[in-house]
């Protein structure tokens, strides 16, 4: 799997999980989230060469098509596969609120 | 939706469905498929600017992150959203076989 266990251990130009820390205030301009101040969002990036972690029949076909037709621009792309939620604390006035924000953290990637 | 109805009607540099006909023999080197000779596989391509068809909270956050941090390389990517199967006919000796190949045709795209 193109996850932290594999990608953060290996120097990999191909599609892989990349570390990215997002500070809510500095990077997004969101001042209302009290905790956490930021989080490890991560992101997916890298080349998708022939059959590198292709996730659908279409991306496999596209991968083969590109190998045979190298001038083509129809190549698969490195995107998130597994995502996890993030729990945040914010305040409504003085009242604390806890919310779970879905699909905020990328755990693994794929070529699609 | 970034589907044929929208994308094939509009000239769109941003993430959109692109037409792609694949000839099994010429483009993939597959001679064993009897029918069809090829099919409209389509593919997804184009830029993913700020919030253009972002499909997850993570891709929305990443989109905002890129707007505020333009030097960052952590941008969403244009990939397939809805896929459909393709039915093929091939022969085992003289015996015809009909198979449905899943996820072979891209019907719409998203930024992920």
């Amino acid at each position: 799997a193109l996850d932290a266990a594999y990608c953060f251990r290996n120097v990999q130009d191909n599609c892989c999980l990349r570390p990215l820390y997002i500070d809510f205030k500095r990077d997004l301009g969101w001042k209302w989230i009290h905790e956490p101040k930021g989080y490890n969002a991560n992101f997916c990036a890298g080349a998708c060469p022939y059959l590198w972690s292709s996730d659908t029949q279409h991306s496999r076909v596209l991968s083969l098509y590109n190998t045979i037709n190298p001038e083509a621009s129809a190549s698969p792309c490195c995107v998130s596969q597994d995502l996890e939620p993030l729990t945040i604390l914010y305040y409504i006035g003085k009242t604390p609120k806890i919310e779970q924000l879905s699909n905020m953290i990328v755990k693994s990637c794929k070529c699609s | 939706a970034l589907d044929a109805a929208y994308c094939f009607r509009n000239v769109q540099d941003n993430c959109c469905l692109r037409p792609l006909y694949i000839d099994f023999k010429r483009d993939l080197g597959w001679k064993w498929i009897h029918e069809p000779k090829g099919y409209n596989a389509n593919f997804c391509a184009g830029a993913c600017p700020y919030l253009w068809s972002s499909d997850t909270q993570h891709s929305r956050v990443l989109s905002l992150y890129n707007t505020i941090n333009p030097e960052a390389s952590a941008s969403p990517c244009c990939v397939s959203q809805d896929l459909e199967p393709l039915t093929i006919l091939y022969y085992i000796g003289k015996t015809p076989k009909i198979e449905q190949l899943s996820n072979m045709i891209v019907k719409s795209c998203k930024c992920s």
């Epitope: 009242t95 | 700020y50 909270q57 905002l64």
Partner: antibody, heavy 121, light 107 residues
Framework: EVQLVQSGAEVKKPGASVKVSCKTS????????MNWVRQAPGAGLDWMGQ????????NYNEMFEGRVTLTADTSTSTAYMELSSLRAGDIAVYYC??????????????WGQGTLVTVSS | DIVMTQTPPSLSVSPRETASISCRAS??????????MHWYLQKPGQSPQLLIY???NLESGVSDRFSGSGSGTDFTLRISRVEANDTGVYYC?????????FGQGTK
Amino acid sequence: EVQLVQSGAEVKKPGASVKVSCKTSGYTFMFYWMNWVRQAPGAGLDWMGQIFPAWGMTNYNEMFEGRVTLTADTSTSTAYMELSSLRAGDIAVYYCARGYGNYALDAMDYWGQGTLVTVSS
Amino acid sequence: DIVMTQTPPSLSVSPRETASISCRASESVDSYGNSFMHWYLQKPGQSPQLLIYLASNLESGVSDRFSGSGSGTDFTLRISRVEANDTGVYYCQQNDEDPLSFGQGTK
């Protein structure tokens, strides 16, 4: 230019529901809190609740809890306020108003033009 | 709930004079070094518009004839060199506690 454009006036019967829309433009709708405020004829302003469109997070004033539902459609940058079990006391102008952005509960820097809801049998 | 009381309920001011409106909260609206008090003007037939943010910060595009002061429970909005265009209802608003609440208005 930030704009909040609300749907037109409504006339409803007692016990019915009303759904008011607020179409926004000129800013990133999904990343700002959207508030709803009502103003009865000749009266002051009452905060009804708020929604953060990106995640659909909502906070309601207990005074309206159970009768008001706030939703948002990020694809069209439109916020909605639905008020059920309408009664004569709900006759008012209803406003959508964008939160300032520093806090969840905050001042409101842009307002819609208002939607008059009349309840009459 | 925090109750906001504005005085006076109505006010008539001659052009070029100074007007003062008071807003008293039923409990302190100060937290984390800020006063969570804001002022709005609602002109006849219009929506409210934000004038003052966090007790004393002039909102962008608002005339510097408007100023806000105060802390804790007592706040004041001052309008210097009053113009006919300043006619309307002025509201204070707190967001220190849920639910957010407004004063009853000063005309």
